[in-house]
């Protein structure tokens, strides 16, 4: 009779994580007497996967009925495959012996590669907000995928970005891999509604890439523009001065009025109006009793936005005598004049 051969017909197989892997093995003879064992890897450090002779292998089942003497099929099925199961599996025939069974012949091996989906990409932006015209970095991370080949793209509002660097780790063979990418984005004043998207494509995703997003609203700070204007006289000796706070983001804003450098009133922004671009406007007004002032009045609108150093805009009210208005019973009072805002 010809000497026994161990045949592993599949040089390699690829299995999706969570599925079962069937490793095929047949022998060509019933002799010598002795068990079949399956190992992962070769050499002294090889890992026993299944032993026909003894042991408990809860994830392994035999494809054929090994209690049938004329069975020559020693294929096994490993359930619930994970990336850690990747490797080369050898079907090995042993000859009954003592003190240990003697390895008689090994199959050529079957390489099992595990297709594992990448985790959902997580995009994170800078810890602190930045203002338009500044460049900020975003990172994207995804883990646990196999095989190593993967494609990562960055988009800002649907437009692909080109300024990014990507690393896949580890560089050598591994059961699974991670990807890390950093993209640079230049902020504009219109970016409150903008999104940065990291898109990951992998063989396991069957053409349906995974996306992670970051809203630039978490990253951007648009500082306000201020305009102080004097409104027409409301009453004989009262002037209404308004401070227009425009195009700011985020909402957190505190405004202080100063009359000749002295705090007149402080208020926190509320009932804001939102612009189409996602920024906000707010208006504060101050009624100034001119008769209470002998000299010119310097009114300052001081705004502290999102914890940043205050910005301010001033307006000079000139106090001067003016004739009594016709039809008015009020006594002559100072005339009002406004200087251009500072």
């Amino acid at each position: 009779e010809e000497e026994l051969q161990v045949i592993q017909p599949d040089k390699s197989i690829s299995v999706a994580a969570g599925e079962s892997a069937t490793l095929h093995c047949t022998v060509t003879s019933l002799i010598p007497v002795g068990p079949i064992q399956w190992f992962r890897g070769a050499g002294p450090g090889r890992e026993l996967i299944y032993n026909q002779k003894e042991g408990h292998f809860p994830r392994v089942t035999t494809v054929s009925d090994l209690t049938k003497r004329n069975n020559m099929d020693f294929s096994i099925r490993i359930s619930n495959i994970t990336p850690a199961d990747a490797g080369t599996y050898y079907c090995v025939k042993f000859r009954k012996g003592s003190p240990d069974d003697v390895e008689f012949k090994s199959g050529a091996g079957t390489e099992l590669s595990v297709r594992a989906k990448p985790s959902a990409p997580v995009v994170s932006g800078p810890a602190a907000r930045a203002t338009p015209q500044h460049t900020v970095s975003f990172t994207c991370e995804s883990h646990g995928f196999s095989p190593r080949d993967i494609t990562l793209k960055w988009f800002k509002n649907g437009n692909e970005l080109s300024d990014f660097q990507t690393n896949v780790d580890p560089a050598g063979d591994s059961v699974s891999y991670s990807i890390h990418s950093t993209a640079k984005v230049v902020l504009t004043r219109e970016d409150v509604h903008s999104q940065v998207i990291c898109e990951v494509a992998h063989v396991t995703l069957q053409g349906d890439p995974l996306r992670g997003t970051a809203n630039l609203s978490e990253t951007i700070r648009v500082p306000p523009t201020l305009e102080v204007t004097q409104q027409p006289v409301r009453a004989e000796n009262q002037v209404n001065v308004t401070c227009q706070v425009r195009k700011f983001y985020p909402q957190r804003l505190q405004l202080t009025w100063l009359e000749n450098g002295n705090v007149s009133r402080t208020e926190t922004a509320s009932t804001l109006t939102e612009n189409k671009d996602g920024t906000y406007n707010w208006m504060s007004w101050l009624l100034v009793n001119v008769s209470a002032h002998r000299d010119d009045v310097k009114l300052t609108c001081q705004v502290e936005h999102d914890g940043q150093p205050a910005v301010s805009k001033s307006h000079d009210l000139k106090v001067s005598a003016h004739p009594k208005e016709q039809g008015s019973n009020t006594a002559p009072g100072p005339a009002l004049a406004s200087a251009a805002p500072l």
């Epitope: 019933l30 002799i31 007497v33 002795g34 002779k53 090994l66 004329n70 009954k96 012996g97 240990d100």
Partner: antibody, heavy 118, light 107 residues
Amino acid sequence: EVQLVESGGGLVQPGGSLRLSCAASGFTLSSYDMHWVRQAPGKGLEWVSAIGTAGDTYYTGSVKGRFTISRENAKNSLYLQMNSLRAADTAVYYCVRGGVWDDAFDIWGQGTMVTVSS
Amino acid sequence: DIQMTQSPSSLSASVGDRVTITCRASQGINNYAAWFQQKPGKAPKSLIYTASSLHSGVPSKFSGSGSGTDFTLTISSLQPEDFATYYCQQYVSYPYTFGQGTKLEIK
């Protein structure tokens, strides 16, 4: 049902011959290593002979050259040809099937008695 | 040839007892040790192979252990039908050899 039935035992004079048969049913005999085991009256078990699936044969020292094990696949039967019989060969002879992969004995026949006496 | 030495040669026990029979091989036999039960006038019955694996249909009160040279057969709770003679065997290499037997009797 898997079964082994021995026959051919009996009384024989020293120096005589006897041929034991073992008819197998429920399995293909040629796919298994097959054995003969004997038990002298009031004594323990003694392995006598075996035939492998490739036709390879094995004997215990005391019967070498006198006993021959064989099989006939067409009849699904095992045989033990015993020549030059001695009084010490007096025993119940059992036909035994070796296990699937390690040759552990799993199925025993009911035995046939061989008496060697003048 | 590999010698198999069983002890004790005979053993008296009561129903419900737990009993252990030991077998020592004259040289290492890996775990190719088997155990058989034989009742008077009957053919032996296979109980255990590869030291600890139970043959199909054998009740779990029988258990085997050991590797190398020392092996044990344990019956966890004796029943009347368990009183018989028990044999160990090595089947790692020819000639296969048996122990001399242990006769288990009712006390």
